[in-house]
């Protein structure tokens, strides 16, 4: 089940995945300039089994230069593509932690991709927090927030950090010197929604994705 | 007919501009036909070969809100329209539907 | 004429299994997911099964999905009578750079 809302945003501190829940989608974005391939795929998706996990689906950019002006684009969509991809690993995931069950790794970059990585996280899946450069952790309790399903509704529990202005950085488990988050702020427009919209998702289907007819124009 | 129409899905609770929409035809007593689906994040657009030409998909990420236009109704454009989530493992939302008549 | 091919209607009686087969190729069903839809009458169409034989929250576990080679399943265990309603799959097609559904089956529960 996908997590209706991103983690919670802490001022000064960003958070990141040690590995991903089985489920776990990541947009297939490309940096300006560059858009998806024809036969490429919307999302990735993390998928398998409690024994082996893997990304489903592979990203690929090219130049919008080539851009076909019919706008006859045409890439492959995320839910559907059963073709694996090798198992993913990378240097930023510390083995135990990415070798969960039920998890894959952070998938390593592709071409010419965003410089934003974009997940929708499943229920279950937790993400751990850090302060930027410049700021220290005061911790009051876990420094990680959870997906979790509560009476039909998802929600991120809050994680117990604060980050002060002084010039330590607190670290991510398993790192032993502190570094940048590797995907970087994830686009956060809905971080607010756990107050203005109650998970509507969830409990207004009809007003979800509501349909209207717009005034009509004799020609 | 001959009419222009632009019809509105509009989507909360979630992350808009990061998820595909579908929209999908269904015409009186008959099945679902996808049409298409946009990325509200830029706009990127892939349309059914069947609907190519015919209707325009758009989207306007401030309102977060999807459109199907037709810039000249037809008969036989008469059809429920659907607007969906489309996710990794099919549509997981739907719209209650937008039903459209097309009469002389 | 829908690319995936679904019998036009299945019938059973309260508490019986039954199931509904939508057939594909190669481009569609074999090498893509398949997806099913229940569309009650007068509703709008719900997810029922995603990734072949996932259910999402809410559903039902008397709903289950399979698929082999270019075919997949949708069966109902412990049939009621609200479960009267079109069924759909759906699958994306290489081919045709689209989603292509079933043309439906009407479940009627005697």
């Known amino acids: 089940e996908l997590c209706d809302d991103d983690p919670p945003e802490i001022p000064h501190a960003t958070f990141k995945a040690m590995a991903y829940k089985e489920g776990t989608m990541l947009n297939c974005e490309c940096k300006r300039g560059f858009r998806r391939i024809k036969s490429g795929s919307l999302y990735m998706l993390c998928t398998g089994n409690s024994s082996h996990s893997s990304w489903d689906n592979q990203c690929q950019c090219t130049s919008s230069a080539t851009r076909n002006t019919t706008k006859q684009v045409t890439p492959q969509p995320e839910e559907q593509k059963e073709r694996k991809t090798t198992e993913m690993q990378s240097p930023m995931q510390p083995v135990d932690q990415a070798s969960l069950p039920g998890h894959c790794r952070e998938p390593p970059p592709w071409e010419n991709e965003a410089t934003e990585r974009i997940y929708h996280f499943v229920v279950g899946q937790m993400v751990y927090y850090q302060c930027v450069q410049g700021y220290r952790a005061l911790h009051r309790g876990p420094a990680e927030s959870v997906c979790k399903m509560t009476h039909g509704k998802t929600r991120w529990t809050q994680p117990q950090l604060i980050c002060t202005g002084e010039m330590e950085t607190s670290q991510f488990p398993g790192e032993e010197k502190p570094q940048a988050s590797p995907e970087g702020r994830p686009e956060s427009e809905t971080s607010c929604l756990v107050t203005t919209t109650d998970f509507q998702i969830q409990t207004e289907m009809a007003a979800t994705m509501e349909t209207s007819i717009f005034t009509t124009e004799y020609q | 007919p001959g009419e222009s129409l632009k019809i509105s899905c509009k989507g909360s609770?979630?992350?808009?501009?990061?998820?595909?929409i579908a929209w999908v035809r269904q015409m009186p007593g008959k099945g679902l036909e996808w049409m298409g689906i946009i990325y509200p994040g830029d706009s990127d657009t892939t349309y059914s070969p069947s609907f190519q030409g015919q209707v325009t998909i758009s989207a306007d990420k401030s309102i977060t809100t999807t459109y199907l236009q037709w810039s000249s109704l037809k008969a036989s454009d008469t059809a429920m329209y659907y607007c969906?989530?489309?996710?990794?493992?099919?549509?997981?939302?739907w719209g209650q539907g937008t039903l459209v008549t097309v009469s002389s | 004429q829908s690319v995936l091919t679904q019998p036009p209607s299945a019938s059973g009686t309260p508490g019986q299994r039954v199931t509904i087969s939508c057939s594909g190729s190669?481009?569609?069903?074999?090498?893509?997911?398949v997806s099913w839809y229940q569309q009650l009458p007068g509703t709008a169409p719900k997810l029922l099964i995603q990734?072949?034989?996932r259910r999402p929250s809410g559903v039902p576990d008397r709903f289950s999905g399979s698929k082999s080679g270019t075919s997949a399943s949708l069966a109902i265990s412990g049939l009621r009578s609200e479960d009267e309603a079109d069924y759909y799959c759906a699958a994306w097609d290489d081919s045709l750079s689209g989603v292509v559904f079933g043309g439906g089956t009407k479940l009627t529960v005697l």
């Open positions: 990734r072949n034989n």
């Open positions: 969906a989530r489309q996710v990794a493992g099919g549509l997981d939302y």
């Open positions: 609770g979630y992350s808009f501009t990061t998820y595909w």
């Open positions: 190669s481009s569609n069903v074999g090498s893509n997911y």
